[in-house]
């Protein structure tokens, strides 16, 4: 036998108090499949997190970060703080990176120099915080 | 027990105005997510208007913001939507009802009362 639920479409649930007819998710809440017996909580971005995308009966809002930070995680489920190129994110703060190293981006971690001699090269162009060594031939 | 009273509905013509209450009794509303939803004539439940601590917020559907107002008192135990700019497609009936939030986090929602029927028509 057919369960009736599996009639109620997405944005809906299944309400078993009333004959298992198909009821609208209350607002801030929302259901992405049919044939559920309860909607989903809305996500609230809220503080560092801003709305990417609004909430909707039928799918979850979505958040990114506040100027100044970067999404981490599923989803963006946690925001970090931006670095300057030439620095990484410490416990501390922003540190530059140590002699020898270097960061591209505004997040991560700094990276050792590319070793040219390991691949028989000369250093072309010297390292720096933000760029990393051009090796020669 | 739980009881939810609605009162005020009636013919209006296009224009008009009215003043819905909802009477709750064994719960305090002030404590609640509640709101109104309405069923049209041969349509299904619809969402009209809420008060909600979870968001913070008070929501409105689109085809009613700006002309729909919720309140609440909370001496009287008592839930109110102010309909103005009545239009014929505000034809339904009008039931109060209760956000509910489950363990787990689901949410659904419960109405009791009878409904108030609204009928906008010249």
């Known amino acids: 036998l057919q369960d009736p639920c599996s009639n109620c479409p997405a944005g809906t649930f299944c309400d078993n108090n009333r004959n298992q007819i198909c009821s609208p998710c209350p607002p801030n809440s929302f259901s992405s499949a049919g044939g559920q017996r309860t909607c989903d909580i809305c996500r609230q971005c809220k503080g560092v997190f801003r709305t990417r995308k609004e909430c909707s009966s039928t799918s979850n809002a979505e958040c990114d970060c506040t100027p100044g930070f970067h999404c981490l995680g599923a989803g963006c489920s946690m925001c970090e703080q931006d670095c300057k190129q030439g620095q990484e994110l410490t416990k501390k703060g922003c540190k530059d990176c140590c002699f020898g190293t270097f960061n591209d981006q505004k997040r991560g971690i700094c990276r050792p120099w590319t070793n040219c001699s390991l691949d028989g090269k000369s250093v072309l162009v010297n390292g720096t915080k933000e760029r990393d060594v051009v090796c020669g031939p | 027990e739980v009881q939810l009273l609605e009162s005020g509905g009636g013919l209006v013509q296009p224009g008009g105005s009215l003043r819905l209450s909802c009477a709750a009794s064994?719960?305090?509303?002030?404590?609640?997510?509640v709101g109104w939803v309405r069923q049209a004539p041969g349509k299904g439940l619809e969402w009209v208007s809420a008060?909600?601590?979870?968001?913070?917020?008070?929501y409105y559907a689109e085809s009613v913001k700006g002309r729909f107002t919720i309140s609440r008192d909370n001496a009287k135990n008592t839930l109110y939507l102010q309909m103005s700019s009545l239009r014929a497609e505000d034809t339904a009936v009008y039931y109060c009802?209760?956000?509910?939030?489950?363990?787990?986090?689901?949410?659904?929602?419960?109405?009791w009362g009878q409904g108030t029927l609204v009928t906008v028509s010249s």
């Open positions: 008060i909600l601590d979870f968001g913070g917020s008070t």
């Open positions: 064994g719960f305090t509303l002030s404590a609640e997510d």
């Open positions: 009802a209760r956000v509910v939030y489950h363990a787990g986090g689901g949410v659904t929602f419960d109405y």
